[in-house]
Interface confidence: medium
């Protein structure tokens, strides 16, 4: 069971300081941006991180949404990352959900975050280069100290 607490507005960056944004095709991508670029591209660079109470002690449960014309929420259904047109629900009556991630702080690095899927234990949000694009994907953690699954989260409100 997950019960919604409150939400905050955040900018999410990978460890190469590229900014996460949602493009015109609703794809989550990373791109080099100056602070003014980041502001100019809002609301596509501003993510709504909603925190949830978890009935099991597993960590800080969150959803990640973005509001352009409508609110879309990040999903990892079938281990494929996409934004689905939906509001983060007030309650989820299950112990796992494709839209719930556990936001974890890397031991020894309080400012570095990981987002582990509640549906797929051991799978994390990651940045992966595909041709010329830096995409947000779901990835099984397979190597120690994998920087691709680490992010910084900067609160905007």
């Amino acid at each position: 069971y997950f019960g919604k607490l409150e939400s905050k507005l955040s900018v999410i960056r990978n460890l190469n300081d590229q900014v996460l944004f949602i493009d015109q095709g609703n794809r989550p991508l990373f791109e080099d941006m100056t602070d003014s670029d980041c502001r100019d591209n809002a609301p596509r660079t501003i993510f709504i991180i909603s925190m949830y109470k978890d009935s099991q002690p597993r960590g800080m449960a969150v959803t990640i949404s973005v509001k352009c014309e409508k609110i879309s929420t990040l999903s990892c259904e079938n281990k494929i990352i996409s934004f689905k047109e939906m509001n983060p629900p007030d309650n989820i009556k299950d112990t796992k959900s494709d839209i719930i991630f556990f936001q974890r702080s890397v031991p020894g690095h309080d400012n570095k975050m990981q987002f582990e899927s509640s549906s797929y234990e051991g799978y994390f949000l990651a940045c992966e280069k595909e041709r010329d694009l830096f995409k947000l994907i779901l990835k099984k953690e397979d190597e120690l100290g994998d920087r691709s699954i680490m992010f910084t989260v900067q609160n905007e409100d």
């Epitope: 109470k53 002690p57 974890r104």
Partner: antibody, heavy 119, light 110 residues
């Protein structure tokens, strides 16, 4: 770097209660779990329960259910552990431990508080 | 009460490699991650390994963890006198809905 500072040593009579505090400084407090772990003299570690201050409710190990109460005050970044109906076998060092990665990965520990239960 | 089994003591000479075992069951290690803590004499425990084999920053790469089935082990290479301490394994236990520690292993550097 987060620091957890615990209250001082206590001597208590059997049947009484003790309340130990744990103040966090230098880092995020509210969204991470604070656990309480005890260690009897010359013995191993024993988890008692935890709280995620932001959630406001605690989880307790079965063994301590009904006898331990874990609370947190977000405004002062302080967690508390109260143990009631004390007996001599509760004599131990009580540690608070922060868990930022996972509620059960204790990456930061307080210095410990010795609680002695003696008549 | 102790659900995870560790040898009470191990020893090794400086520069040697030692391993500490931790044996559990399908309700804990078999289906969950293992963490290791080091407790130097008179001090609070310190996280050494988390999620089976991850080292927090600041922990030397002489320390490594592994897991297979319902057992886990901690390996320390290039043993140093400052490694003399108690070592505890820890895992989540679904049957007791609790986290469990091993009984601890005292490492002596000869």
């Amino acid at each position: 770097e987060v620091q957890l500072v615990q209250s001082g040593a206590e001597v208590k009579k059997p049947g009484s209660s003790v309340k130990v505090s744990c103040k966090a400084s230098g880092g995020t407090f509210n969204s991470y779990a604070i656990s309480w772990v005890r260690q009897a003299p010359g013995q191993g570690l024993e988890w008692m329960g935890n709280i995620i201050p932001h959630y406001g409710f605690a989880y307790y190990a079965q063994k301590f259910q009904g006898r331990v109460t874990i609370t947190a005050d977000e405004s002062t970044s302080t967690a508390y552990m109260e143990l009631s109906s004390l007996r001599s076998e509760d004599t131990a060092v009580y540690y608070c431990a922060r868990a930022a990665y996972h509620p059960l990965v204790f990456d930061n520990w307080g210095q410990g508080t010795l609680v002695t239960v003696s008549s | 009460d102790i659900v995870l089994t560790q040898p009470p003591s191990v020893s090794g000479a400086p520069g040697q490699r030692v391993t500490i075992s931790c044996s559990g069951s399908s309700s804990n290690i078999g289906n969950h991650y293992v963490n290791w803590y080091q407790q130097l004499p008179g001090t609070a425990p310190k996280l050494l390994i988390y999620r089976n084999n991850h080292r927090p920053s600041g922990v030397p790469d002489r320390f490594s963890g592994s897991k297979s089935g319902t057992s886990a082990s901690l390996a320390i290479t290039g043993l140093q006198s400052e490694d003399e301490a108690d070592y505890y394994c820890q895992s989540w236990d679904y049957s007791g809905f609790s986290t469990v520690f091993g009984g601890g292993t005292k490492l002596t550097v000869l």
